[in-house]
């Protein structure tokens, strides 16, 4: 046989027997010649360094580059693979040789006792056992102890090869100690030397210490490292640490092997560090190596050591938060401390407990902010061990962006005459204010709700051609007034007023308010009408149960048809900021209701009365009324708004006081209901009547005795009534002091 | 700086004994596995022996089995390979290696051992 | 044992080109932890071996990332780009998956 590849026009070395397997027997002589182009040397088993005595290799007396291998009374350990190659090549030629002997069908290793088989538990991997053969063709088993085992090759995955050895499955010899070959040779049975098994594993899955991260002592106290070991199975660890002070007197190492469960592929192993009484030496990296002789893994964690227990505010501990309504909040206690501080939170002084809305823990969670979130939060850290406190101020800035106060009114808006002069009105509230309040408008007949148009959340307008209000050709002639402020409802608003000089061409008008937070609109509908006018008889809002008739006038010449309607609910919902259909357009929703109708010179009239109005009564009137040539229809919408009844209460400054004679008494007793109440004022339950030293002013509200003398001592009530009933305060007013002469006895008793 | 400085390579007859020291500076030698690799005249690379960090665990190639012995004295900072019944297929450039996740993560300069009659 | 195999020499490269090294395996090195246990390594003329990739892919500290690993469970590639003359030497791979770890023969990367 030959191996190698052959180089530039070089021949094999050529054998005297050409045969890739000889079998010879044991005791008779091997002889083999190699013939050659250039200089050869022979390899033979067991001994590759030529230094074996009983093998001669000489050179042939018939020619150069030819070498002969003799070996007188071969052995079964003379079994294997002779080669003949070209020095410093690949270039040879090998004959495998069988010296058979019955006796020794094993061969053995020169130096070996027993030989060693490095296994692992892997199901898929095999194993060769070395057992060669000094005979090709034996029944050879295998067996494994203890307890004693028999393995007879099965044609699949256990098998024996005479130049190779015994193979089989790792996993069924895991368990043994020692394996050897066994040949049958006419009833009697030959052994290979012993293998010892060893089980190999090797890697270290991963090293972890406990705990991990973020350990902190003070000076005395005791610290305790574990690290762990994930490692395959059969497989031993070595541990060691490195850290600080490593020559520590008060250091314990425990390493031990951890249970694990049965099944588990598995194993792991414990090594325990432990200071007792650490010191600010001790601070540092604490590494721990794991090693299995192949593979090693390791693992730090830095160990901080304080001199005494402290607590402190970290410097990215901030002191103002900005926020926007809604958004959750989140303002971290940042401290530096040992061992963790108690954290308590306050707003404005008083503590705050965590709940579905709030979450006081390290971190001050307020899941969804409002305005009332605003204000200063005190974070309070408290040392556990030493009791020592620190505070710190977190001012919570809470952004609104504008609102529009008006857009919560989505029905029509009235419809204004042609030619007068109107005012549209956005009240703006945000935080902060606005830095601008912008006014657009649009032609009606270029924003109508067609169904063409698709409305969405995102942009619920159908109008996108919005003009600046300076830019007011072919619309109506407009000034901006300068933004106002009002504290409305306890919160300081920006008004915002659009003036129309003449209401000559129906239009949209939005507002547009921006803050640093956000935007917010409104868009009016601006109805000119040329038609009918509504106006209301009294002129002013009515109270439940009073009568109110609203009347239509219209130019008899250019319109007929007069008739009333009241607006129905609008179909819900209406998409913030959508805009209603035009009224006219859609009739569907009309009620039609039945009024009078009167005539005067020029005008009809048609009066629409109410009588003991309600609150059902509130809504949406429509007038009606039809151009005699062109038959088009106008419309006017007016917004009737009932008032609720109330009772009357009493609010103001009425109390008990005591004055000097001479000097003035000012009381206010300020009444609201609706209606609205009389006011009455009573001095020992009996009308006071006014004079020149008690004076009533603004409907009785305000009631002032000049120079009181000692008679105005006594009970004073203030009175307030309406069909609804009455409400009364009452206070006793004392007169001190010396009068005239005349007047000293009594001035005497009254004290 | 990571230093491994091998010593002891010599020339040595078929059958004879030798042995190899690495001293070890720059790191903590004692919390690193350590291992001996050959290079073969014919440059090939052949992993020799591995100990781990202690000592207590040690692994041989086939070929060295039995009578090579590696240890190391973590007190010196040094590893060892004594080498006995050396054999001609011995003769290399042997390395010292740092062994950290498995990896030989540096290697000394070597130092080389003929086995020669 | 795990039999590696690599290719005697590179393709001749010239100074800025890439070049790209074999290694094969006689068994799957891809452990059943999901990592895949193939080293590479330079040994430049006169100075010893030199880690350069870990675990198939990853890159050992220093080493310039001219140098990328890749592969399967047994065939593997290491690309250089943009040779300079610093990269000439023997390239080796080196399995970790099973005991006893094997390198492979060795791979001269030759410059035209």
């Known amino acids: 046989a030959s191996v190698g590849l052959p180089s530039v026009s070089l021949d094999l070395p050529r054998l005297s027997i050409q045969k890739d397997i000889l079998t010879i027997k044991a005791n008779t002589t091997l002889q083999i010649t190699c013939r050659g182009q250039r200089d050869l040397d022979w390899l033979w088993p067991n001994n590759q360094s030529g230094s074996e005595q009983r093998v001669e290799v000489t050179e042939c007396s018939d020619g150069l580059f030819c070498k002969t291998l003799t070996i007188p009374k071969v052995i079964g350990n003379d079994t294997g693979a002779y080669k003949c190659f070209y020095r410093e090549t690949d270039l040879a030629s090998v004959i495998y040789v069988y010296v058979q002997d019955y006796r020794s069908p094993f061969i053995a290793s020169v130096s070996d006792q027993h030989g060693v088989v490095y296994i692992t538990e892997n199901k898929n991997k095999t194993v060769v056992i070395p057992c060669l053969g000094s005979i090709s063709n034996l029944n050879v088993s295998l067996c494994a102890r203890y307890p004693e085992k028999r393995f007879v090759p099965d044609g699949n995955r256990i098998s024996w090869d005479s130049k190779k050895g015994f193979t089989i499955p790792s996993y069924m010899i895991s368990y043994a100690g020692m394996v050897f070959c066994e040949a049958k040779i006419n009833d009697e049975s030959y052994q290979s030397i012993m293998y010892i098994v060893v089980v190999v594993g090797y890697r270290i899955y991963d090293v972890v210490l406990s705990p991990s991260h973020g350990i902190e002592l003070s000076v005395g106290e005791k610290l305790v490292l574990n690290c762990t070991a994930r490692t395959e199975l059969n497989v031993g660890i070595d541990f060691n640490w490195e850290y600080p002070s490593s020559k520590h007197q008060h250091k314990k190492l425990v390493n031990r092997d951890l249970k694990t469960q049965s099944g588990s592929e598995m194993k792991k192993f414990l090594s325990t560090l432990t200071i007792d009484g650490i010191t600010r030496s001790d601070q540092g990296l604490y590494t721990c190596a794991a090693s299995s002789g192949l593979m090693t893994k390791k693992n730090s964690t830095f160990v901080r050591v304080h001199e005494k227990p402290f607590v402190a505010f970290g410097s990215g501990m901030e002191s103002l938060v900005e926020a926007t309504v809604g958004e959750r909040v989140r303002i971290p206690a940042k401290y530096l401390g040992y061992p963790p501080p108690e954290i308590k939170w306050y707003k404005n002084g008083i503590p705050l407990e965590s709940n579905h809305t709030i979450k006081a823990g390290h971190v001050l969670t307020i899941m969804e902010v409002s305005e009332r979130d605003t204000g200063n939060y005190t974070v309070i850290l408290t040392n556990p061990i030493s009791k020592e406190k620190q505070s710190h101020v977190v001012s919570l800035v809470v952004y609104v962006p504008p609102q529009i106060g008006e857009k919560s009114l989505i029905s029509p808006v009235d419809s204004y005459q042609y030619g007068t002069t109107q005012t549209l009105t956005c009240t703006v509230y945000a935080i902060p204010p606005p830095h601008h309040i912008h006014w657009y408008w649009q032609l009606e007949e270029e924003c109508a709700n067609e169904p063409s148009h698709a409305v969405s959340v995102t942009n619920p307008y159908p109008c996108e051609e919005w003009r600046s209000v300076e830019d007011f050709q072919g619309g109506n002639k407009i000034e901006v007034n300068k933004n106002q402020f009002a504290l409305i409802e306890g919160k300081n608003k920006t008004v915002s007023t659009l003036v129309i000089q003449a209401a000559n061409v129906s239009a949209l008008y939005k507002c547009e308010a921006v803050n640093k937070v956000g935007r917010g609109e409104r868009v009016i509908s601006f109805h000119v009408t040329r038609g009918p006018e509504i106006t209301l008889q009294p002129d002013m809002q009515p109270t439940e149960q009073e009568s109110v008739s609203l009347w239509c006038t219209a130019d008899r010449s250019t319109f007929e048809n007069l008739t009333w309607y009241k607006l129905g609910p609008q179909p819900l919902p209406i998409h913030v900021g959508e805009l209603p259909t035009p009224v006219c357009k859609n009739l569907d929703t009309l009620w039609k209701l039945n009024a009078t109708m009167f005539s005067n010179s020029t005008n009809d009239i048609l009066i629409m009365e109410l009588k003991n109005a309600s609150l059902q009564d509130q809504g949406d009137y429509v007038c009606l009324a039809q151009d005699r040539k062109t038959k088009k229809r106008h419309c006017v919408v007016r917004q009737l708004t009932v008032l609720e009844r109330v009772a009357p209460t009493i609010t103001g400054n009425l109390e008990n006081q005591t004055t000097s004679i001479g000097e003035s008494i000012e009381v206010s007793c300020t009444a609201s209901g609706n209606p609205p109440p009389q006011i009455m004022w009573f001095k020992d339950n009996e009308t006071l009547v006014e004079d020149s030293g008690i004076v009533l002013k603004d409907g009785n509200r305000n009631l002032t005795i000049r120079r009181v003398r000692k008679e105005d001592e006594g009970l004073y009530t203030c009175q307030a009534c309406s069909v609804l009933g009455c409400a009364k305060v009452e206070a006793f007013f004392i007169i001190e002091g010396a009068q005239e002469k005349t007047n000293l006895e009594h001035h005497h008793h009254h004290h | 700086e990571v230093q491994l400085v091998e010593s002891g390579g010599d020339l040595v007859k078929p059958g004879g004994s030798l042995k190899l020291s690495c001293a070890a500076s720059?790191?903590?030698?004692?919390?690193?596995?350590m291992s001996w690799v050959r290079q073969t005249p014919d440059k090939r690379l052949e992993w020799v022996a591995s100990i781990s960090i202690g000592g207590s665990y040690t692994y041989y190639a086939d070929s060295v089995e039995g009578r090579f012995i590696i240890s190391r004295e973590n007190a010196k900072n040094t590893l060892f390979l004594q080498m006995n019944s050396l054999k001609s297929e011995d003769t290399a450039l042997y390395y010292c290696?740092?062994?950290?996740?498995?990896?030989?993560?540096?290697w000394g300069q070597g130092t080389t051992l003929t086995v020669s009659s | 044992h795990i039999m590696i195999t690599q290719d005697e020499l590179s393709n001749p490269v010239t100074f800025g080109e890439s070049v790209s090294i074999s290694c094969r395996s006689s068994k799957s090195l891809l452990y059943k932890d999901g990592k895949t246990y193939l080293n590479w390594f330079l040994q430049r003329p006169g100075q010893s071996p030199q880690l350069l990739i870990y675990l198939m892919s990853t890159r050992a500290s220093g080493v310039s990332d001219r140098f990328s690993g890749s592969g399967s469970g047994t065939d593997f590639t290491l690309e250089i780009s943009r040779v300079k003359a610093e990269d000439v030497g023997i390239y080796y791979c080196q399995q970790l998956v099973e005991y006893p770890f094997t390198f492979g023969s060795g791979t001269k990367l030759e410059i035209k």
């Open positions: 720059g790191f903590t030698f004692s919390m690193y596995g």
């Open positions: 290696a740092r062994e950290l996740d498995g990896n030989y993560d540096y």
